[in-house]
């Protein structure tokens, strides 16, 4: 015998209290697949979260973070404070990258400058707190007496950063 609930489409639930007829999901709930016996409560984007996509009867709300924060985790389960380029977030707040490391984003950690010699290359542009080095030709490719290292590009505006 076919389960009568299997006829209930997304956006409805199979209501045992009404002899297994398909009832629409109540306000602030959804069912994304057919044949559901309950509707799920919509996610609410509160506090540091803001609504990226409203909840509908067939799909959950989606949240992102308010300015100054960025998403972490699957489906933006957490919001983490932004830092400036050239910094990383520690338990004590945003801290400048140590010498030899950089962060060109508002999120994430300070990473070591690329070791150009790993690839048999020379350093073409020096690294900064905000930028990785740019690797250039192998030292053998440089003409005698030619200087290989360019000073880093001028520092950018603090807001000028990825994501």
């Amino acid at each position: 015998l076919q389960d009568p609930c299997s006829n209930c489409p997304a956006g409805t639930f199979c209501d045992n209290n009404r002899n297994q007829i398909c009832s629409p999901c109540p306000p602030n709930s959804f069912s994304s697949a057919g044949g559901q016996r309950t509707c799920d409560i919509c996610r609410q984007c509160k506090g540091v979260f803001r609504t990226r996509k409203e909840c509908s009867s067939t799909s959950n709300a989606e949240c992102d973070c308010t300015p100054g924060f960025h998403c972490l985790g699957a489906g933006c389960s957490m919001c983490e404070q932004d830092c400036k380029q050239g910094q990383e977030l520690t338990k004590k707040g945003c801290k400048d990258c140590c010498f030899g490391t950089f962060n060109d984003q508002k999120r994430g950690i300070c990473r070591p400058w690329t070791n150009c010699s790993l690839d048999g290359k020379s350093v073409l542009v020096n690294g900064t707190k905000e930028r990785d080095v740019v690797c250039g030709p192998s030292p053998a490719d440089l003409s005698p007496g030619a200087s290989s290292v360019t000073p880093p590009a001028p520092a950018r505006e603090p807001g000028h950063s990825p994501q």
Partner: antibody, heavy 119, light 107 residues
Framework: QVQLVQSGAEVKKPGASVKVSCKAS????????INWVKQAPGQGLEWIGN????????NYNQKFKDKATITADKSTSTAYMELSSLRSEDTAVYYC????????????WGQGTTVTVSS | DIQMTQSPSSLSASVGDRVTITCRPS??????LNWYQQKPDKTVKLLIY???RLRSGVPSRFSGSGSGTDFTFTISSLQPEDIATYFC?????????FGQGTKLEIK
């Protein structure tokens, strides 16, 4: 020599998912970003996102955030990109690339993987 | 996102001609501008990185110049093997973006 070898062409139905692989050889896999780039038929190149295999840190183009998931397996020196809820507009050649000693240009490209979405 | 306006979208030139392609980002990208060649078989190769640096092994007829929001790619003397589509790309700010490409044909 440094090489990126991608998995073969795929034909998928709308709504399905596909996982494209990119096997790296000839260098230390964990020391360089792997990027993924899309090229739809007759179109230009679009950056999808990248991964730093050492710690699996990822960046995504907002446009592809709900479409692509990029992962890496250090033990096999392989990067992956999974595309979900496929639609006809996902039909494209997908390239993996490695950066040129820092993350601002790409000097190694895979041969490309054609993904066709058709009912 | 930074928009990359590349022109022309296609051009036809004779062997030995000087060919110039321009790329204009929608905001200052310092020198983080790269040029790629895509052959008809779809293989892609980096030619020039950091605006003007020729990748090792790339013929010296290819060159690049510019800074900020105005960049130029030049082939000083076109060869038959240069038939390809050329793309600029900015590596300054995520998401990294490409120009729409210039398809180069031989007359």
């Amino acid at each position: 020599q440094v090489q990126l070898v991608q998995s073969g062409a795929e034909v998928k139905k709308p709504g399905a998912s596909v996982k494209v692989s990119c096997k790296a050889s000839g260098y230390t896999f964990t020391s360089y970003w792997i990027n993924w780039v899309k090229q739809a038929p007759g179109q230009g190149l679009e950056w999808i996102g990248n991964i730093y295999p050492s710690d699996s840190y990822t960046n995504y183009n907002q446009k592809f955030k709900d479409k692509a998931t990029i992962t890496a397996d250090k033990s096999t020196s392989t990067a992956y990109m999974e595309l979900s809820s496929l639609r006809s507009e996902d039909t494209a050649v997908y390239y993996c690339t490695r950066d040129y000693g820092s993350s601002y240009s790409y000097n190694v490209w895979g041969q490309g993987t054609t993904v066709t979405v058709s009912s | 996102d930074i928009q990359m306006t590349q022109s022309p979208s296609s051009l036809s030139a004779s062997v030995g001609d000087r060919v110039t392609i321009t790329c204009r980002p929608s905001q200052d990208i310092s020198n983080y501008l790269n040029w790629y060649q895509q052959k008809p078989d779809k293989t892609v190769k980096l030619l020039i990185y950091y605006t003007s640096r020729l990748r090792s092994g790339v013929p010296s007829r290819f060159s690049g110049s510019g800074s900020g929001t105005d960049f130029t790619f030049t082939i000083s003397s076109l060869q038959p093997e240069d038939i390809a589509t050329y793309f600029c790309q900015q590596g300054d700010t995520l998401p990294y973006t490409f120009g729409q490409g210039t398809k180069l044909e031989i007359k």
